[in-house]
């Protein structure tokens, strides 16, 4: 049974509702019309809707849907954005502390190596920061560069203080000797392993959080299809055409429509669940050498031990290096 | 306050870092995040239901709209889309996700693979090859105190290495302090949009 036409057989009530959506436009018929041109709200009898109104309803329906989606994801989005920012800031603070601790170790134990050591330490921790943020830097190279840079200064300041200030050519020979003779023992390898493991995990943790934001942003700004727009219009607005302003859609019908509109989005579900569970697994494993806070804040100690190792073997090393880098040293003395 | 580098007497193998009761560490913050994220594990599957519950639907009314006509809420017609031949709901589902959704699914697959690769079996502290080289530091036995270093004359214990307070208020070196970098944390009671979307059906 078609519902009765609006009171007094006018479309007055429909007009006042539509005015809220589209103020000032005269698209609402004065009295119910056949509505043969309608494509979505197909009438069973006279209707208070025109083709233009239908288009406006479709636009509004899709807009409503987008707003509902955005409000649905607001808390989740805020949670991830907030944490991504907090963790990035926290990791940078850890790096800054680690740098300060390492500089303090040099200042207190090896004042003759400063300020050069400060610069090498600064470079190392700069690269650490950049690596965490996703830069294409090799951790082993970073650690090698730190020890390559430190050794010429240790050699000329601690082991062989008689040498003049080191020039680049003897430095290069000393850098080569550092690796060939394993002057720091296994400490560089230990640091490489610990730093690379902890930084890799930290980096992927931040990457995962940033991807979480991207996922929410993507689904947040989805543009719904015309088909979906028609379904939503029929569910939310077609009742108006019959003057049924206060009627609400049936719950089961709404679910069917939403599942149709969101079929694509719901496909993310499986991978989203896996994402959260995989992230949990990663976080559970972030301790000891997989925890950058633990590793970086302890680096000063390992570097200190590595320099002590060099000092213990200084006699033997000085003789060997004296022969190895004799050519460079002669050039420097001239 | 945290000690400045001048206050770190490394030669005495002592590292003082302020300890605050009930402080929030980075690892506890990570775990807290995971717990909160897990309450959103059903976010996407629950979305259709969430949107229906947050848009006008007939809950207590006897009559409701099924897209074509007014029907009784519990009748068979209530769930049926009244407009047959308009377009097929099944077709809409068959179209598959939009390209942007497919792209994000690919990215999720990739990160999930990376996360799985990186996740370490519980209890493994150091790699075998490092253990063999004699760098295994042994278990400190106390979650609060982590061993750092691993050779030389005695280990350094760092008590709760960083106090990770919600607003990241560290006593940093003046020349190292970031300008206006304090980050407020969302308080649970400030969030009113919705809770536990995963539980909405």
């Amino acid at each position: 049974q078609p519902p009765p036409p609006p009171p007094d057989a006018t479309c007055h009530q429909v007009r006042s509702f539509f005015q809220r959506l589209q103020p000032g436009l005269k698209w609402v018929p004065e009295t119910p019309v056949p509505g043969s041109d309608l494509q979505v709200c197909l009438p069973k009898g006279p209707t208070c809707c025109s083709r233009k109104m239908e288009e406006k309803y479709q636009l509004t329906a899709r807009l409503n849907m987008e707003q509902l989606l955005q409000s649905a994801s607001m808390e989740l989005k805020f949670l991830i954005i907030q944490n991504a920012a907090v963790f990035q800031e926290a990791f940078e603070i850890v790096v800054r502390h680690a740098k300060n601790y390492t500089n303090a170790m040099f200042k207190n134990n090896y004042p003759s190596l400063t300020p050069q050591a400060f610069e090498f330490v600064g470079e190392f921790f700069t690269d650490v920061s950049l690596y965490i943020l996703g830069s294409d830097i090799n951790v082993d190279d970073m650690v090698n560069e730190l020890f390559d840079s430190l050794f010429p200064v240790i050699y000329t300041q601690l082991m062989n203080p008689g040498l003049p200030d080191s020039a680049l050519d003897i430095n290069e020979c000393l850098r080569g000797a550092r690796r060939d003779l394993k002057v720091f023992g296994n400490f560089p390898k230990l640091i490489m392993t610990q730093v690379s493991k902890s930084l890799q995990v930290t980096r992927i943790f931040l990457q995962a959080l940033n991807l979480g934001i991207e996922v929410i942003n993507t689904t947040d700004h989805l543009k719904f299809s015309k088909d979906c727009g028609r379904m939503l219009t029929r569910m939310w607005y077609c009742s108006y055409c019959q003057g049924l302003m206060m009627v609400k859609p049936c719950g089961g019908y709404c679910n069917v429509v939403m599942q149709g509109c969101m079929a694509g989005v719901v496909e993310i579900d499986k991978y989203w669940r896996e994402y959260i569970l995989s992230l949990e697994e990663l976080v559970n494993g972030m301790y000891r050498i997989y925890d950058m806070e633990n590793v970086l804040l302890g680096l000063f100690s390992t570097i200190h031990d590595s320099i002590q190792y060099v000092q213990k073997n200084a006699g033997k090393l000085t003789t060997t290096i004296g022969k190895l880098c004799a050519h460079s040293q002669q050039r420097q003395y001239r | 306050s945290a000690y400045y580098p001048e206050d770190l007497f490394i030669d005495k193998k002592v590292l003082k870092v302020a300890h605050v009761e009930h402080e929030e560490t980075l690892s506890s913050r990570r775990r807290e995040l995971i717990q909160k994220l897990k309450s959103f594990i059903s976010f996407y599957s629950a979305l259709p239901g969430y949107i229906c519950s947050h848009s006008p639907v007939a809950e207590n009314d006897t009559l409701c709209w099924n897209g074509q006509e007014l029907v009784e809420r519990y009748s068979q017609k209530a769930a049926r889309n009244g407009m047959k031949n308009q377009f097929n709901l099944h077709e809409l589902k068959m179209k598959g996700p939009e390209p942007v959704v497919s792209q994000i699914i690919d990215k999720l697959k990739h990160i999930n693979q990376l996360l799985r690769t990186m996740s370490m079996p519980k209890g493994r502290v150091l790699d075998k090859n490092l253990d063999e080289e004699g760098f295994e530091s042994g278990d400190c036995g106390d979650d609060e105190d982590e061993c750092i270093g691993g050779s030389g004359d005695g280990m350094i214990k760092v008590k709760n290495q960083l106090r990770f307070l919600a607003e990241l208020a560290y006593d940093l070196d003046v020349d190292d302090a970031p300008g206006n970098s304090q980050q407020a944390t969302p308080k649970d009671n400030e969030i009113s949009t919705f809770h536990n979307l995963g539980n909405v059906h």
């Epitope: 050069q116 610069e119 090498f120 600064g122 470079e123 700069t126 690269d127 920061s129 950049l130 943020l133 830069s135 294409d136 830097i137 090698n144 560069e145 390559d148 840079s149 680049l168 430095n171 290069e172 850098r175 080569g176 | 020349d175």
Partner: antibody
Framework: QVTLKESGPTLVKPTQTLTLTCTFS??????????VGWIRQPPGKALEWLAL???????RYSPSLKSRLTITKDTSKNQVVLTMTNMDPVDTATYYC?????????????WGQGTL | QSVLTQPPSASVAPGKTARITCGGN??????VHWYQQKPGQSPVLVIY???KRPSGIPERFSGSNSGNTATLTISGAQPMDEADYYC?????????FGGGTK
């Protein structure tokens, strides 16, 4: 797009201090991984690096000129300033500032037009 | 005297392959960048991190680096490629340029 422009006096008397300003756009010196460097080139000669400042305010100087150079940044104004004390006729050169990608091993990927 | 050694000049017939070398002790362990500078102009980055080409740089420019020599190669050199070429590397905390090749 990234642009940099050097400005400063064209003529400086011996023993005086040279102050050069690099004004840039298209990037921010508060972005992680960004740096700005100064390089000079005496007429008909090779490029010589002077100084580099990082986003985190770390500074690096040429060892041979370190005692005479100071590099500073003003992030809000998008400017980097280089001062060089005790100028000498041998310091006559075109002075360039350049954008540096610190992560890409300190490459200088965008250069200013230079100031003589 | 620069720690990175470049030949002062190099010449090649149009369409042929030009190779410019940059020598340095164990330079293969460094990342080397190459710049092109035409008369009266600012330098332009043509190769970075040994082998990478910035966008807008023709494919004829390529780079390699191993042992004690880094090389910039211009395959099918053109008259417009006539310029000074500088190699650059980062030594710990110091930026070093080669002496340039015309």
């Amino acid at each position: 797009q990234v642009t940099l422009k050097e400005s400063g006096p064209t003529l400086v008397k011996p023993t005086q201090t040279l102050t050069l300003t690099c004004t840039f756009s298209g990037f921010s010196l508060s972005t992680s991984g960004v740096g700005v460097g100064w390089i000079r080139q005496p007429p008909g000669k090779a490029l010589e690096w002077l100084a580099l400042i990082y986003w985190n305010d770390d500074k690096r100087y040429s060892p041979s000129l370190k005692s005479r150079l100071t590099i500073t940044k003003d992030t809000s104004k998008n400017q980097v300033v280089l001062t060089m004390t005790n100028m000498d006729p041998v310091d006559t050169a075109t002075y360039y500032c350049a954008h540096s990608r610190i992560a890409a091993r300190r490459v200088l990927d965008y250069w200013g037009q230079g100031t003589l | 005297q620069s720690v990175l050694t470049q030949p002062p000049s190099a010449s090649v017939a149009p369409g042929k392959t030009a190779r410019i070398t940059c020598g340095g002790n164990n330079i293969g362990s460094k990342s080397v960048h190459w710049y092109q500078q035409k008369p009266g102009q600012s330098p332009v980055l043509v190769i970075y991190q040994d082998t990478k080409r910035p966008s807008g740089i023709p494919e004829r420019f390529s780079g390699s680096n191993s042992g004690n020599t880094a090389t910039l190669t211009i395959s099918g050199a053109q008259p417009m490629d006539e310029a000074d070429y500088y190699c650059q590397a980062w030594y710990s905390t110091i930026m070093v340029f080669g002496g340039g090749t015309k």
